[in-house]
Interface confidence: low
């Protein structure tokens, strides 16, 4: 308790390590013949308190005992957890210029006695591993605390290891360095942890276990898979395991999946047949092991084996659609389109498509292979034609899908009625219709087809389509639907040998157009004015244009302008008006209207009609 220094000593009562909440007395004594020269009675001893090297208090007022010029005792209370430094200094009061001189110092540690360690858990990793135990130490003691782990077992087996916790490191795990072997499988072992520091000691409750309780097998290794006859759905998974393993758990899943397929295998001896794999699919396989059917712990999962199953021939039916265009009086161009098979149908990398166009009477057959999802040919307009497409991978081809080539919009009686298009949200449109009224043959299916109404879209972009069963009268279209773009939507009703269609325009979201149409010319013919314009550029339309409005008023008039509203038609770019007075100068302009509102006005043109008014 005494720190001997040159000028004097500092002692602590009851001890330099005290429990939280306790007080301590610190005495500072000068050695003989030390102190202020000539004037021993002017010796003043002061005590300074430092925390983390910072002066926090002068304990001058805490003096409880004083031998003038020789020794002083101070009481310190409310010390915080951890280390606090106290330094005693000598102040010679007759010399104001000299600072106090350090006499001696002492560090007091405040902490708590250790709590009994709890939640002891022991493991041995693998048959050749060593026993390691961990525990919960409880509250931080703020003091150096020693922990002893003791193990006892059959045949007078005893073993112990020690470690300590302080402000730099934590001790809550120890490896005993001994190996428990399977021949001790039925034996019971006991461990306990004892904690001790300067303020007390405590011991855990004894923790009892057997070999099977604590041995965790090493995870399986060297995992591989063999596909039987290059099958894409059957494979034998193989692996290496520790000798005592009797139970394995296998889990496997496609890489993009969120749920595992789980299999338990007893006495698998490093081999298991899987029969339900998907061809041409990236899989992840993992295996875990256990040493006993009922007791013991599972090993960690093995490292993943990632591999792709082999291909198998495609299954499923291609979704085919087509466009027909007459070229001249005896030739037509047929463009076939089809959608890629989804991965579970393709069952491999599609290498090409086999396309056949055949005249029904078998007079003419055109065949080709292509890697694209479209094919165009010019054929005679005479005869009844049918098309078929199949998809091929390295293992074979899918069954061909057939479609009859009919005049898609040729039969008015098959045209669906009351077609409407409503925007549902930013990226889809709900299309509804009523069946044809007087169809003389049954509707086999509906096709809803759409494409953006933008220049060149027919030649540049393939159509998008959905097949709808004959008893459904609605479709939610979303593929390639973007806001503020107008789409032409066609609903086709197809029978075995005929087709009828109705058309509508629709958008998923709209705004008022950015600008109005640009008037290019005003001409006078037979007492009528013809207004000609150019359409609003496609990006500025911002949805489907419903109407154009032509406004006019006398040049210097402050009256409201008159207007004429025209139903929008893409093919129309001029319109007559006939209510203008001759020899009066008018100002004319145009706007465009979507469901969201009217555009700003386009350019203004002045015109003075010459003819006679109606």
């Amino acid at each position: 308790n005494i720190d001997v220094c040159k000028l004097g000593t500092v002692t602590v009562q009851p001890a330099p390590v005290i429990p939280l909440g306790s007080a301590a007395n610190i005495s500072c004594s000068l050695n003989p013949k030390q102190g202020c020269s000539h004037y021993p009675s002017s010796n003043e001893l002061i005590l300074l308190k430092f925390v983390n090297d910072v002066l926090v208090e002068n304990l001058h007022g805490k003096k409880v005992h004083d031998h003038t010029g020789h020794s002083s005792t101070f009481q310190v209370t409310n010390l915080s957890l951890g280390m606090t430094l106290f330094v005693c200094k000598l102040n010679c009061s007759n010399s104001q210029k000299k600072p106090p001189v350090p006499v001696c110092g002492v560090e007091i540690s405040v902490g708590v006695a250790p709590e009994p360690p709890q939640n002891i858990s022991c493991v041995q990793e693998g048959e050749n591993g060593t026993v390691a135990c961990s525990w919960n130490s409880g509250k931080v003691t703020y003091l150096k605390t020693n922990y002893t782990l003791q193990l006892s077992g059959p045949n007078n087996l005893t073993c112990q290891k020690q470690c300590f916790s302080d402000n730099r490191q934590n001790c809550n795990r120890l490896d005993l360095g001994i190996n428990l072997s399977p021949d001790l499988a039925e034996s019971r072992f006991i461990v306990r942890v004892t904690a001790i520091n300067d303020l007390g000691n405590s011991s855990s409750l004894p923790h009892t276990f057997t070999f099977l309780d604590i041995v965790i097998p090493l995870p399986p290794w060297d995992i591989r898979i063999n596909f039987l006859n290059a099958s894409g759905s059957r494979g034998t998974l193989q692996w290496e395991d520790e000798g005592q393993v009797v139970l394995n758990q296998l889990r496997y899943q496609p890489l993009n999946s969120t749920s595992w397929n789980m299999v338990n295998a007893t006495n698998a001896k490093g081999k298991y047949d899987l029969r339900d794999l998907r061809p041409f699919t990236e899989y992840e396989f993992q295996i875990s092991s256990k040493l006993h059917l009922s007791g013991g712990s599972w090993s960690n999962w093995s490292e993943s084996l990632r591999t792709r199953t082999p291909e198998e021939e495609p299954v499923g039916i291609l979704d085919i659609w087509y466009m027909k265009q007459d070229i001249d009086y005896d030739r037509q161009q047929i463009s076939l389109f089809w959608k890629s098979l989804n991965p579970s149908e393709a069952r491999g990398k599609i290498l090409h498509y086999q396309v056949t166009l055949q005249e029904v009477t078998k007079k003419t057959t055109l065949q080709n292979t292509t890697r694209h999802t479209s094919w165009t040919r010019v054929i005679p307009r005479t005869g009844a034609w049918t098309a078929s497409v199949s998809a091929a991978n390295s293992k074979g081809a899918s069954a061909p899908t057939h479609i009859n080539i009919v005049d898609l919009c040729g039969t008015g009686l098959l045209a669906p009625h009351q077609v409407s298009a409503k925007s549902e949200n930013m990226d889809n449109i709900l299309v509804t219709w009523q069946p044809p009224k007087k169809a003389d043959s049954a509707v086999r299916e509906y096709i809803v087809e759409w494409r953006a109404l933008q220049p060149g879209s027919i030649t540049k972009f393939p159509p998008h389509w959905l097949r709808i069963p004959p008893d459904n009268m609605s479709a939610l279209i979303s593929e390639n639907i973007k806001p503020y773009i107008c789409y032409e939507i066609r609903v086709h009703a197809l029978s075995e040998s005929q087709g009828g269609c109705s058309s509508i325009r629709g958008d998923s979201k709209h705004k008022a157009p950015v600008s109005g149409p640009h008037i290019t010319a005003i001409t006078e013919k037979k007492e009528r004015l013809f207004i000609s314009w150019t359409h609003i550029p496609f990006p500025e339309q911002r949805g489907c244009i419903l109407h154009y409005r032509i406004y006019w008023k006398e040049r210097d008039s402050t009256a409201q302008p008159e207007l004429c509203e025209i139903q929008y038609r893409r093919s129309q770019n001029s319109h007559p008006i006939s209510s203008l007075q001759p020899r009066v100068t008018y100002v004319l302009w145009m706007t465009a209207v979507t469901a969201a509102g009217e555009s700003p006005q386009g350019n203004e043109r002045e015109f003075c009609p010459q003819g006679k008014a109606n």
Epitope: N52, D53, V140, C163, N167, R168, Q169, N170, C171, R173
Partner: nanobody, 131 residues
Framework: QVQLQESGGGLVQAGGSLTLSCTAS????????TGWFRQAPGKEREFVAG????????????SYADSVKGRFTISRDNAKNMIYLQMNSLKPDDTGVYYC????????????????????WGQGTQVTVSS
Amino acid sequence: QVQLQESGGGLVQAGGSLTLSCTASGRTFSSYTTGWFRQAPGKEREFVAGISSGGSWIGDITSYADSVKGRFTISRDNAKNMIYLQMNSLKPDDTGVYYCAAASYGTRYYVGSTANEYTTWGQGTQVTVSS
């Protein structure tokens, strides 16, 4: 109390390397978790890397911001009371004032990644990466 002083900043070409040092004074330095933060002009101070005072049982724990993983390495030398930040493959986005910071935790197997978890800060050193 620990005091911190950074050094080693400067101007470097994109793709180059720099090593920042942080000198710490104070006897309890080795029990502090220490981090590097940076602040680009007009932006908030952001965590770059941190190292805990794990002690001899499990060793030091390091933590890095996603943007610097694989390029920056934080280390400490308790005997010299120094922390280092080795910066490789520097990018113009790494430009800013780099600060050394320290925090004392009851349990030190943890590296804080927000500025308010650190109690002591250095003055900072400027790093400029030109393209």
